[in-house]
């Protein structure tokens, strides 16, 4: 039968500039010499020769003068090879050839990685900052491999997403220098954060950069929203509202107004230098221009999604600046219930039936309630699910388990606990004569 | 080092269009606002507008609104400003200058010579 | 568009001697303004921005002062070397707008 050659399943790990070890093993059977051993390692693609042992001699590395064997434990079945200096060309797959009188062979994988530097920060521009500025923060990384995950958050851990670019480039020896650039609007003050990760050493790199912008002599703008969250229904408009107190004289060209997604930082819409920016939200935004001037910073949001809701930030800057977040709760009514019973035909007291109650598109998420014609709360044996789709709305579908009376009347209602909007359905079942004792 | 390179001197005749060029180096292009300058001899600075690099997003003085077109090139990080419909009072030294409120880095500037 | 008016038009001073160029804005500014020096031949360069914050390189000797609608620039002690053009310019509004320019001269 055919030899038996061992290799760990997980690739070997090696930093770049060490040595690694390629584990190769095999049993040799009693009075084994090594002038009956051939061994060879190659890369397993090219079939490359790398190292070679024959007729009880090494016959040296063909691989950069770089390999070497363990020739003390060959005779114990040790093959392993000791591969030196790694470098990124290295990574690959490795197969361990052993013959004696059979022969077997096995690959083992190197999977070469180099930690990232700590990474150095640059923010463009770097002085004279007010909020409503768009600055450009750089996260550099050098001499790392493989390529890096890079990852943005504010002060807060929230990670930020929108407009950052990410390039990686390999140097002359395949390690990779990360440049991700964030691009953001300021607010009051910020933290911003870099994270570069290495996938395969687990290995996290970070670095962050506080911006305070320059403040007036003459104090921060008051900017007053609404305490209570604003509620629109899916598919209608809703205006988040946004007012300051202009100060006499005060021209529209002195104004900086930026919406943003409170979170994530991503710009909605900006009135900037007496013009309106637009909308940089899916285009379903926009100001009242002509409130503006007198202190109305308001936003219309068009045609409500699921996807909207949130917290919006007001952020307005004139000499100085204030921000204030108003928070957006989305609704959509549901649909008045269908109900369901299974089996729906002969039947009689003491069967038990399944009646389900079914509600769609609605927003958020449902409360379900039973009760039976004297309205009774009936909690048992009722399992409700909910599925949201594409759009994030609701199908609710709750599945209520019953034994038949003599007569039942049960209804369903279904809750929106945002609209306090309650649809209802009630089905009545009416079972068959009864004969005494009931038939079996 | 930042540096904003702009061609010596160019020489039009008057009706004529020219496109001048303001080529940046050492510093992330898209992250400064780019404005142009002109300066006749002897006489002080006008502001005819800038351009963001990052979505070329533009601010003109009225007064040339007619008169220049500015426009970048991301790939070369170089500015353009094309003025057009060329006069002898277009004679002039014009600057590219980075920045939004403070101007902190020029170009040597561009002498242009409108002359039949 | 915010008129920028700046005095004198020119002035002639002697090496060590203080000098001190004003800038009138047609309108509050708050703190936006900024100085330039362009000596002959040369583009113009960053002194003062803030109305008051010295740009990094810039000698000690030059220091603003001001706000809302009273800028200056002093320099003191006048050195051979600060011989040149000197401009103010507003960065509250779009256009920005720049002062005629002083003309200092050495004595």
């Known amino acids: 039968g055919a030899l038996e050659v061992q290799v760990p399943e997980d690739p070997v790990v090696a930093l770049v500039g060490t040595d690694a070890t390629l584990c190769c093993s095999f049993s040799p059977e009693p009075g084994f010499s090594l002038a009956q051993l051939n061994l060879i390692w190659q890369l397993t693609d090219t079939k490359q020769l790398v190292h070679s042992f024959a007729e009880g001699q090494d016959q040296g590395s063909a691989y950069a003068n770089r390999t070497a064997l363990f020739p003390d434990l060959l005779a114990q079945g040790n093959a392993s090879l000791r591969l030196q200096r790694v470098r990124v060309a290295d990574e690959g797959s490795f197969t361990c050839f052993v013959s004696i009188r059979d022969f077997g062979s096995a690959a083992v994988s190197l999977q070469v990685a180099a930690p990232y530097s700590k990474p150095s920060m640059t923010l463009e521009p770097n002085k004279d900052l007010r909020p409503g500025d768009t600055v450009t923060i750089t996260c550099s990384s050098y001499q790392g491999y493989p390529e890096a995950e890079v990852f943005w958050q504010d002060g807060q851990g929230v990670p930020l997403t929108g407009n950052v670019t990410t390039s990686q480039m390999a140097n002359e020896q395949g390690l990779f220098d990360v440049h991700s650039i964030l691009r953001v609007v300021l607010g009051a003050n910020g933290t911003y954060s870099c994270l570069v990760r290495n996938p395969v050493l687990q290995q996290d790199a970070h670095s962050s950069v506080t911006i305070t912008p320059q403040r007036s002599p003459t104090g921060a703008v008051e900017v007053q929203v609404p305490e209570d969250p604003v509620v629109a229904l899916v598919g209608t408009d809703a205006t988040l509202r946004c007012s300051f107190s202009p100060e006499p004289g005060f021209s529209l060209a002195q104004l900086n107004l930026i919406w943003q997604l409170t979170d994530t930082k991503q710009l909605v819409h900006s009135f900037t230098e007496g013009r309106d920016q637009g909308s940089a939200y899916a285009n379903r935004t926009a100001l009242f221009p002509d409130l503006l001037a007198q202190g109305n910073a308001s936003l219309r949001l068009q045609r409500v999604r699921v996807a909207d809701e949130g917290s919006f930030t007001c952020f307005v800057s004139i000499r100085d600046f204030g921000s204030a977040a108003v928070s957006l709760q989305v609704a959509a009514p549901y649909s008045k219930p269908s109900m369901t019973l299974e089996p729906n035909k002969d039947l009689r007291p003491g069967d038990t039936v399944t009646i389900t109650c079914s509600s769609y598109r609605g927003y958020p998420e449902a409360e379900v309630f039973w009760q039976d014609g004297q309205g009774v709360p009936l909690t048992g044996n009722v399992t409700t699910s909910q599925m949201a789709n594409e759009q994030g709305l609701f199908d609710v579908h709750s599945v209520l388990r019953v034994v038949l009376g003599a007569n039942g009347t049960y209804s369903c209602l279904v809750r929106n606990p945002v609209l306090q909007q309650d649809a209802h359905g009630s089905v009545t079942i009416t079972g068959q004569p009864m004969t005494f004792p009931p038939e079996a | 080092q930042v540096q904003l390179q702009q061609p010596g001197a160019e020489l039009v005749r008057p009706g004529a269009s020219v496109k001048l060029s303001c080529k940046a180096s050492?510093?992330?292009?898209?992250?400064?606002?780019m404005n142009w300058v002109k300066q006749r001899p002897d006489q002080g600075l006008e502001w005819i507008g800038r351009?963001?690099?990052?979505?070329?997003?533009?601010r003109y003085n009225q007064n040339f609104r007619d008169k220049a077109r500015l426009t970048v090139d991301k790939s070369s990080s170089t500015a353009y400003m094309q003025l057009s419909s060329l006069t002898s009072e277009d004679s002039a030294v014009f600057y590219c200058?980075?920045?939004?409120?403070?101007?902190?880095?020029w170009g040597q500037g561009t002498t242009l010579t409108v002359s039949s | 568009d915010i008129q920028m008016t700046q005095s004198p038009a020119s002035l002639a001073a002697s090496v060590g001697e203080t000098v001190t160029i004003t800038c009138r804005t047609s309108?509050?500014?708050?703190?936006?303004l900024a100085w330039y020096q362009q000596k002959p031949g040369k583009s113009p360069q960053l002194l003062i921005y803030?109305?008051?914050t010295l740009e990094d390189g810039v000698p000690s000797r030059f220091s603003g002062s001001g706000s809302g609608t009273h800028f200056s620039l002093k320099i003191n002690s006048m050195q051979p070397e600060d011989t040149a053009t000197y401009f103010c310019?507003?960065?509250?509004?779009?256009?920005?707008?720049f002062g005629g320019g002083t003309k200092l001269e050495i004595k």
């Open positions: 803030n109305a008051n």
């Open positions: 351009i963001d690099p990052y979505d070329s997003e533009t």
């Open positions: 050492g510093y992330t292009f898209t992250a400064y606002w």
């Open positions: 309108e509050n500014i708050d703190y936006t």
């Open positions: 310019k507003q960065a509250y509004d779009v256009p920005r707008t």
């Open positions: 200058a980075r920045g939004v409120r403070i101007f902190d880095y």
